[in-house]
Each structure stands twice: as C-alpha cells, then as structure tokens.
Interface confidence: low
C-alpha cells in the first residue's frame, strides 16, 4: 500500500502566439481545479477506461477574473497535494492523466458548469521511494507544470511497496509470524502474502501474489488433486513424472477481475473482493452514483442513489462524455453556409449570416438589388431566392457588364435585318414577311397569317405594323413586369427584414443569457 | 435511497418568524446546490431560494418575492439546509418543499406554513 | 421572469385514453423543460426532463415532446394511478418557474 502524489506548479498560456489569454468563457469568472487519474501499464487506454490505480480530484482554487490589459499570468490554483492512495502494489510502470477544469460561476440553475480545459496524458516509469519527478506538459494553448512521486506507507517498503515490514525499535524484537528485513537490520518482515485462495495445505509462495503447488496437486490456487491415471509420463507443476496439467484454464485465470479486483475459486466458479468504489460479479460496477453529483455541465443522472447501482449521464445539447464532461464542437461541422459566422450557445447552434443572406444556416441568398445594382443600365430582377440582371441592349452577362451585340444570333428570320434597340431589338423584314422576328409570311391576296389587323394598320404596310405591335408588346410587358418586381420585392424585403430583427433579438438574448 | 425531509412548519402571525429545516440522507451532501420551492393553490409551485457550495462561498440566491426577508443556509457536517423566515406575509403560506438535483430530481414531503391572524 | 402556461387547467378521462397536456412558454426555452406528476399529499415527483427525456423508473406511457415555447406530455394509455396534478417548469433562465399545473382527474 502506498501514496502517489502529484504537486501542480502552475498552469497557464503556452509559449507562442495564439496563447489563450483567459481561461474563462465570456459568462464571467471562473475557477480552476484538477483531477489526476492513475491506470496500469504502459498501454494507450481510452479516456474513458476506468482509473483502476486510483483518481483524486483537488480543491477549487480562486477565483480568477480576466484582466483586460494585464498580461496573461499563470493562474491561481488550488492549494494542496493531489494524493492517489492505492492499496495494492505499486505498478512501476503506470499511465499518469491530469486534466484541468474549468467551473464557471455564471447564473447556471441546477449546478456550477463544468468544462474540461486541458488533458495531458503521459505514460510513465517510476519506483516508489524515490525522489521528486519533474514534469512539463503542453495541452492545445495550455502549459502545465507539475511534480509526482509514489511513497509507501508502512509496513509496506520497497519499489513496489510489496515488502511488509514492521520497525524493530517498539517491540525489542520480531513478533509472531514476522522475520529480519533481509537488507534493513533495523526492521522485520512478514511472510509473502500468498496469492488470495491459496490452498494453505498444499500451495506455499515466495513471492507475494504467487501460489506455488505441492507434489501431487495442480491449478492456479493447488485446489486440484493431479490425476495419476490418464496423465502419466507428463511432466507436471512441481517437475516429476507422476502429475499431469488440468486441461483449460481454472476459473480465475486471467483474473476475470475488472478494476483492480482479486480472484478467488469456489467450487466451479470464482468470487472477485473488490477494491473500494467498485462493485458487481467482477468489480465492473463503479461505485460513484448520483448522488455523488458525477454528471458535469448540468447532465442528469440517472441511475439508483444506492451503492449497487451504477449511474449514466445524459447530457445536455453541446456536451458529451460518460459524465459529460467534453464539449461537442459543434461549429467544426460547418453548418453556416454562404460565409456565415458559426455560434454555440450550448443548448443550440446560431448562424451569424454575412449582408444578402438568411435563414438558420444562412442558406437563403437574399441578394438584394440595392446591394448589387445592375451595371449599364441593367434592371435587377428577384425571385426564388436568387437575383438576375434584364439588361439593356448591348450588355449581357450576371451583372451586365459584359458587351454584347443583340443581333450576333441573327434573330430575325427571313433575311429580315436586325437593328439594336434601347428596348431590344427590331427587325426589318423582308418584302413578304411580317412579326416581331418575321417570322409570318404574308399571303399573296394581302392577308397575313397573324389575327385581323386594328383599324388604322393597312395590311398592305405589313412591316410598319410589325413593327407598331412589337414596340407596343415590348412596353407593355415592361410596364407590367416593373410593377409586379416592386410588389414582390417589398413583401420579400418585409418578411426577411422581420425574420433577422427576429433572430438578432434571440442571439442577443441568448447570448447574455 | 434518496430523502429529505422538511420539519418546522406551523401557523403564524403576519410580521412573525419561522426557521425551516431540512435534513438530506443516501446523498453526497456536500455536492449538491439546495433549494427551496414551495407549493399554495393561488400561485402553484414557486422556487423560493438557492444556495451553494462550501466551494462557492455558500453563494445564495432568492426570489424576488422574498429577498430581504428569508435567509437560506446549510450546514455540511449534519446534511441539513435551513430556510429563516422573517416578516412574514399572509402571501407566503403554502407548503414548503426542499429540493435538489439538476431538474430538481430529489424532494422532501415538504412541510406546512400558515401565516394567519 | 419566464412565464410557463399549462392548458387545460383540469380534464377528465377514462382509463385506456389517450391524454395531451400542454405547455407554452413566454419566450424561448430550449428544450430546458421538466414535468413533474404531483399525486395526492404527495410531493411533486420528476417525470420527464430535458422536455423529452423519461426519467429513471417512469413508465413508457409517458412521452414529452417540443422545443422553444410549445411543450407537450402525453399519456399514451391513461391508468387509475395516472391521477394527479402535472406540472412543467423551465430551467433555462434563472430563477426556474413552474406552470399553474393541470389536473388529472380518472372517471
């Protein structure tokens, strides 16, 4: 048994440009505390992987109020070792996680908020007993400081704190059952502790945790009588000829144990003594609950208050996490189109959208005719969301500033001529044709193929009537089509301009909310 | 198993006192930010006052109802939380319920108030 | 402060009915909604959090829907022991408030 203990030095910006200069949101001043997590081995764990060493969790430390022209200091922090008892032997070989958080002290209802701020995770050598180890780490824009060590608490000594010993100075001399500290005069030792279930009869161990089997007995805890009948010639545990291996596995090995537990048989199956904080058939079972208040960032926990049962977080919008303690970056999906600027509020995604565009995700392209006039003399057109430019005779293109020549696509059929016009284009048709593009042959009694003229037009002038009706046509439609884009342009430019007044009044809100 | 229970309720006149208390088991106490809501048929349910951690300073909130006149206050040790109630209203009779967890999760039976002449 | 309205303010149904109670808030609230169910001399008891989350031990019957401002709790198949007041309350701005509550009454 023995302590590992973590001393944090500071905690600040990172060296470099773009370090942070606060590490409270904009709802105001926060606080900083930490939470360091032992696993064994050498192994990339997940996050989420139980801390089955231990895990310990500081005290909040002060207050901290961004100053808006001093320079980013290292932060307050709380004061104190972190210690991580552990009850067996020390690994030597371990994963050390330290995450800082961040608690908000905002108007929050349920509880502070709670966000994870950095996480540095190192895999690390260490013997117990030793001095001091020095550590610097980076986490994103964040730099941490820190000092770790792991000590035995007697009567265990040693690297791993396996050795048990007891001082010889209180009692003149060794008690019942304890022996000389081989290499510490002063001190006296027990027994190796056997491996838990070890048959006292027939297994014996040297080392701690072992279980070393008698001649004529086999098995992880020497419980299983060697067969001499079907195994002879097999060389058994204890290295004669009269035993024989158990085929398959006996029920604890590979320690079915979760989370630090110990196996022992029973008569076909196995039994698991959990360490303290883990409960179930194989220690699975965490034993923080909900009321231990586990859910960060306002999750709800769900799950019995009483110490059998485990516990599930369900986290509100914009965090997740077995105890919600990650935020989902939700903006990193790019939901704003068009260039929109890209809001998490937490409970819900704001689109900030750029001049011309609307809607929840910007994806409406207002395109307003005010803000993208038609060049040259070009009439702005709205409708569906989008914007063209009508432009005038000898300009084309998406805002009519490209020349173009009306009558390049001959349009005027018949060998009529083509004349460019400020309304369009007019046609001289061809003696025998009439139409805006002569496109109708006129009959030889005189009559043409088109409705019977209005009084005033001979039938005999075909080219001047063709050419009174297509100008007459043309402004009409004009006319016509100015009125009907006003109209529709002042209800779109309406309901848009109620929807953002609308919309910017929420963000607001919920912005200083 | 979750509980909490309300004690010190009873009738008392307009401009009186009243101290309620409230004492939480099978909860890490200490972990919990404390409220309390009380219930009459005229108004239905009304949060009432808030306080929180050691690590907060004890930081307390109240209803604007009642600011200036009810002091909320806990103490870890014993898993309890108080309400003092001062220059009291008629308004302020109801049953008074205290309350924890994030959605208000955890009640106690609450327990009742009468201020009457 | 945050105004939450219930409607009805009682109903009466039979056992096996499909019940909708309502809820509608004066501004924007997410989906930071809870009902509570409230038996007779008993102390409100947690239903539905999160506007649509079931809470640990409630019965599949009951369902909360909405966002924003429009809340509802449905009772997919009313039982006798469905008698009750129901309440919501809104815990997205400070202070948290509660409707007036709707009554549930079995014929």
């Known amino acids: 048994a023995g302590v590992f203990e973590l001393q944090i030095h500071s905690f600040g910006p990172g060296p470099g440009p773009g370090a942070p200069r606060s590490p409270c949101s904009a709802r105001g001043p926060c606080r900083l505390f930490f939470r360091v997590c032992l696993k064994p081995g050498l192994s990339e764990e997940a996050a989420e992987s139980p801390c089955a060493l231990g895990a310990a969790l500081s005290a909040r430390g002060p207050v901290y109020t961004e100053q808006p022209e001093a320079p980013a200091p290292d932060l307050p922090l709380p004061n104190g070792l972190l210690q991580v008892p552990f009850r067996d032997a020390w690994p030597g070989t371990f994963s050390l996680i330290i995450e800082t958080w961040r608690e908000e002290l905002g108007d929050q209802i349920g509880g502070p908020a709670w966000s994870l701020l950095a996480r540095v995770t190192r895999r690390r050598r260490l013997a117990a007993g030793g001095p001091w180890a020095r550590d610097i780490q980076r986490a994103g824009a964040w730099e941490l400081r820190f000092s770790y060590r792991a000590r035995c608490e007697l009567p265990a000594v040693g690297t791993a704190c396996t050795r048990l010993c007891r001082p010889r100075s209180a009692p003149s001399r060794c008690g019942p059952g304890l022996r000389p500290c081989a290499p510490l005069e002063d001190e006296c030792e027990a027994p190796p502790v056997c491996r838990a279930g070890c048959s006292l009869e027939h297994g014996f161990c040297e080392q701690p945790g072992e279980c070393r089997c008698l001649e004529g007995w086999t098995g992880p805890l020497c419980m299983v009588p060697v067969s001499t009948s079907s195994c002879l010639g097999l060389r058994g545990p204890s290295s004669t000829t009269t035993g024989c291996l158990v085929p398959g596995p006996g029920p604890c090995d590979g320690n079915p144990c979760a989370n630090g537990g110990s196996c022992s048989e029973t008569p076909g199956s196995f039994e698991c003594t959990c360490p303290r904080g883990f409960y179930g058939l194989r220690c699975e079972v965490s034993g923080v609950t909900c009321a231990d208040g586990p859910c960060f960032n306002g999750g709800l926990c769900v799950g019995g208050a009483d110490p059998d049962s485990a516990y599930i977080c369900h986290c509100p919008p914009g965090f997740q996490g077995s105890n919600c303690e990650k935020r989902v970056d939700r903006c990193s999906l790019q939901p704003c189109r068009n260039g929109g600027l890209c809001l998490d509020l937490g409970h819900a995604l704001r689109c900030r959208c750029r001049a011309g565009f609307a809607g929840p995700r910007c994806e409406h392209d207002l395109d307003d005719c005010a803000g993208r006039a038609c060049a040259n003399g070009g009439t702005c057109v709205e409708g569906g969301g989008a914007h063209r430019c009508s432009c005038a005779l000898g300009f084309g293109g998406r805002n009519c500033r490209e020349r173009a020549d009306p009558c390049a696509a001959r349009p005027c059929a018949h060998g009529g001529r083509c004349y460019a016009h400020f309304s369009g284009l007019v046609c001289a048709c061809a003696p025998g044709y009439m139409g805006a593009r002569c496109e109708f042959p006129v009959h030889p009694d005189g009559v043409s193929a088109l409705p019977a003229a209005p009084p005033g037009l001979r039938p005999g002038d075909p080219q001047r009537a063709g050419v009174i009706a297509v100008i007459v046509v043309v402004v009409i439609a004009i006319v016509a089509g100015i009125v009907v884009l006003v109209i529709s342009r002042k209800k779109r430019m309406a309901k848009y301009e109620k929807a953002e007044i609308k919309e910017m009044g929420e963000m607001h809100r919920e912005l200083n909310a | 198993e979750v509980k909490l229970e309300e004690s010190g309720g009873g009738l008392v006149q307009p401009g009186g006192s009243m101290k309620l208390s409230c004492v939480a088991s099978?909860?890490?106490?200490?972990?919990?930010?404390m409220n309390w809501v009380r219930q009459s048929p005229e108004k239905g349910l009304e949060w009432v006052a808030q306080?929180?951690?050691?690590?907060?300073?004890?930081?307390?909130h109240y209803a604007e109802s009642v600011k200036g006149r009810f002091t909320i206050s806990r103490d870890d040790s014993k898993g309890s939380v108080y309400l003092q109630m001062n220059n009291l209203r008629t308004e302020d009779t109801g049953i008074h319920y205290c309350t924890t967890g994030y959605y208000f999760d955890y009640w106690g039976q609450g327990t009742t108030l009468t201020v009457s002449s | 402060n945050i105004v939450m309205t219930q409607s009805p303010k009682s109903m009466s149904m039979s056992v096996g009915e499909r019940v909708t109670l309502s809820c509608k808030a004066s501004e924007n609230v997410g989906t930071y909604v809870s009902w509570f169910q409230q038996k007779p001399e008993q102390s409100p008891k947690l239903l539905i959090y999160?506007?649509?989350n079931r809470y640990t031990g409630v019965p599949d019957r009951f369902t909360g829907s909405g966002s924003a401002t429009d809340f509802t709790l449905t009772i997919s198949s009313v039982q006798a022991e469905d008698l009750a007041d129901y309440h919501c309350?809104?815990?997205?701005?400070?202070?948290?408030?509660f409707g007036g509550g709707t009554k549930l009454e079995i014929k």
């Open positions: 306080i929180r951690l050691k690590s907060d300073d004890y930081a307390t």
């Open positions: 999160g506007a649509s």
């Open positions: 309350g809104q815990f997205y701005s400070f202070p948290c408030t």
């Open positions: 099978g909860i890490t106490f200490s972990n919990f930010w």
